[in-house]
């Protein structure tokens, strides 16, 4: 499955939109930094079959979409930017879903992939727990926004590596 060129442009647009969503000075939030334990090893792309990588990417985008689709998120961010960001993520999900269906027919995805997907889910659980503990404060959202920008960058890099393998 070849992800369309528009997919990588969508990635870039999503990152730009997320960068624009900041509402307060990040400098006031330094003390709120937190270790969310991003599962980097799931995004290095070396030990994966293509089908596995695509399903992990899908989970990453799906969880990001869910996080920014909550009522608390709507209250935190400027609405038009949030809607554009969600639209970009939704389009990426569609692209990846088409690929997942195609690739799973080609390769039998081993159980190891379930561990990778679980690692991504647990990562987002930690993010949600942090937001809850911080009572969804503006600084907590800023820290999460920075974290998601970082994790989406990892996703983008994995997608680039997948395209090079094609």
């Amino acid at each position: 499955c070849d992800l369309p060129q528009t997919h990588s442009l969508g990635n870039r647009r999503a990152l730009i939109l997320l960068a624009q969503m900041g509402r307060i000075s990040h400098f006031s939030c330094l003390k709120d930094r937190h270790d969310f334990g991003f599962p980097e090893e799931e995004f290095d792309g070396h030990q994966f079959q293509k089908a596995q990588a695509i399903s992990v990417l899908h989970e990453m985008i799906q969880q990001t979409f869910n996080l920014f689709s909550t009522e608390d998120s709507s209250a935190a961010w400027e609405q038009s930017l949030l809607e554009k960001f969600s639209t970009e993520l939704y389009q990426q999900l569609n692209d990846l879903e088409a690929c997942v269906i195609q690739e799973v027919g080609v390769e039998e995805t081993p159980l190891m992939n379930e561990d990778s997907i679980l690692a991504v889910r647990k990562y987002f659980q930690r993010i949600t727990l942090y937001l809850t503990e911080k009572k969804y404060s503006p600084c907590a959202w800023e820290v999460v926004r920075a974290e998601i920008m970082r994790s989406l960058s990892f996703s983008t890099n994995l997608q680039k590596r997948l395209r090079r393998k094609d």
Epitope: A19, F27, L30, M149, R150
Partner: antibody
Amino acid sequence: EVQLVQSGAEVKKPGESLKISCKGSGYSFTSYWIGWVRQMPGKGLEWMGIIDPSDSDTAYSPSFQGQVTISADKSISTAYLQWSSLKASDTAMYYCARHPGLNWAPDFDYWGQGTLVTVSS
Amino acid sequence: DIQMTQSPSSLSASVGDRVTITCRASQSITNFLNWYQQKPGKAPKLLIYFASSLQSGVPSRFSGSGSGTDFTLTISSLQPEDFATYYCQQSLDFPLTFGQGTKVEIK
């Protein structure tokens, strides 16, 4: 390979203006903040201020607020430190360093080689 | 501002010695504490971040410990290349502040 390359040594007279630079390469320049640190001859390290190149937001140490200006041009991955009117007491080595911002990652993990500024009449 | 106080300000030691440098913050900084090494004419180099995490490429003889207000940098077996000045720095809040430095000299 991540690198921060600073502009060369400067010799200036009191009252003159100066702008020194720090060019980042080998990483996404807008994903990290750039901090500036002063080291006067034979002395310790003093944090001056920081910039987020993605939006040019800045924060200064109270000791340096109003004394210097920090700026950045993300199109050329370069941060700047400038003085409008130098004093003899500005004579020092100035370092730029990369900061991960709000991400949980090492602070000031890469440093420039330093720019020696000498102010003398 | 958070004040950082290092001790001692200088020490003399021999190759192979175990060296300990302490850093005290004027208020709790949890684990937002970094250690740097600086050699004459060179830029500082990050050794330890978040109080106890060893920076990539730094020899394992360097270790950091502590939380709250009291922190320690330990060099388990001093090597010739370790003679330098060491700085602690808090990264909890702005303004970021450094300790005054500890110079490790050859005995």
